[in-house]
Amino acid sequence: MRTEAQVPALQPPEPGLEGAMGHRTLVLPWVLLTLCVTAGTPEVWVQVRMEATELSSFTIRCGFLGSGSISLVTVSWGGPNGAGGTTLAVLHPERGIRQWAPARQARWETQSSISLILEGSGASSPCANTTFCCKFASFPEGSWEACGSLPPSSDPGLSAPPTPAPILRADLAGILGVSGVLLFGCVYLLHLLRRHKHRPAPRLQPSRTSPQAPRARAWAPSQASQAALHVPYATINTSCRPATLDTAHPHGGPSWWASLPTHAAHRPQGPAAWASTPIPARGSFVSVENGLYAQAGERPPHTGPGLTLFPDPRGPRAMEGPLGVR
């Protein structure tokens, strides 16, 4: 939900620096306004990583770039253009975590990011070009989804680029971005004024084109992140699609419950609760995320409450809702 500032096409009075300067000085405030409006818009990033040690094992990491508190996270997978999708895990901050094969371990990494380990063989095995989607809900603000996949040619141990591109927290990025552009704008305006202080101020004349003249868009840097949200799906092998609902859950329903102790089911309220989670400096955070852990050569640390997986003592259908097979 980004806002584009649109600037009417202005016809300069005469060719030359004066006309160009007048146009640029008019465009600049609109660009700044656009940045202010779009700063802090929540976004979601997704990172898919195939483990070098286990070729059938994937780690999906997702994060929410926004200021609201997360009320639910849903991780799903499927084929291209939404074909054959199904839910892998649902993470609720108070009610716990629910996951379905081939998801092995879903967990909160931080207050605004989760990770999911997937492994399996046969029908429910993930493939290198499967599409994974994460949807973060923040009540009552809304919800946001992003998808990612490993390209078929990816080497084990490497990650797909996080989607969308921006990795800094949205609010921080907004503040830094607007501050930087404002500073640059002021310096630029001072430079122009100083350069042209002895020249008459340019007069803007009405456009000589028709009233329906095309409008010039003031493109803000933040719109690149909007474009990044619309990443085309990777081509996927139909033989490599996630299992159908019946084959993925042969027992007729989710038979595993990822249980969190009541006190651990709540996400931490502050950094202290996640003291064991290494928090990199801002610079390294960006480089680690954008470098997709290539620099570190390590898997991202998994911390937080331990998940206890246990089959329901009443049998595989005991926890099933009326839906039956998912």
């Epitope: 009320s71 639910l72 849903t74 799903s76 997978w77 499927g78 939404g82 074909a83 054959g84 999708g85 199904t86 839910t87 649902v90 609720h92 009610r95 716990g96 629910r98 599409t131 989607c133 949807k135 809900a137 009540f139 009552p140 809304g142 919800s143 946001w144 989804e145 998808c147 609902l245 099933e320 809702g321 009326p322 839906l323 039956g324 097979v325 998912r326």
Partner: nanobody, 127 residues
Framework: EVQLVESGGGLVQPGGSLRLSCAAS????????MSWVRQAPGKGLEWVST????????SYVDSVKGRFTISRDNSKNTLYLQMNSLRAEDTAVYYC????????????????????WGQGTMVTVSS
């Protein structure tokens, strides 16, 4: 941003029919289970029906079984609820939501327990 927009509500006489629609955008609709929930005046949120991601499985609360039919068209990113033989007790605001409330239990349902939610559409059954 994800958006779910319900339509089709209105005033209908007992025994009448309505078809609710929910247009989804901003997410991969076909990857997710979808549900209808409702909230009668002065009451809590009640689960009505759920359909899985490919439309092959459906479930209903007992009070609407045989009268309501949930369906979806993944090519149009739209969820439907066909309501027949409407009764006065079906009067409520109907919400389209993403997710299956059975994941965490039907007790004390709230919109915040779902992955996405619409603004709701009012259905009034009255003579």
């Amino acid at each position: 941003e994800v958006q779910l927009v319900e339509s089709g509500g209105g005033l209908v006489q007992p025994g009448g029919s309505l078809r609710l629609s929910c247009a989804a955008s901003g997410f991969t609709f076909s990857y997710y289970d979808m549900s209808w929930v409702r909230q009668a005046p002065g009451k809590g949120l009640e689960w009505v029906s759920t359909i899985n991601s490919d439309g092959g499985r459906t479930s209903y609360v007992d009070s609407v079984k045989g009268r309501f039919t949930i369906s979806r068209d993944n090519s149009k990113n739209t969820l439907y609820l066909q309501m027949n033989s409407l009764r006065a007790e079906d009067t409520a605001v109907y919400y389209c939501v993403e997710g299956d409330p059975h994941n965490f239990g039907l007790e004390n349902l709230a919109l915040r327990d779902f992955g996405s939610w619409g603004q709701g559409t009012m259905v009034t059954v009255s003579s």
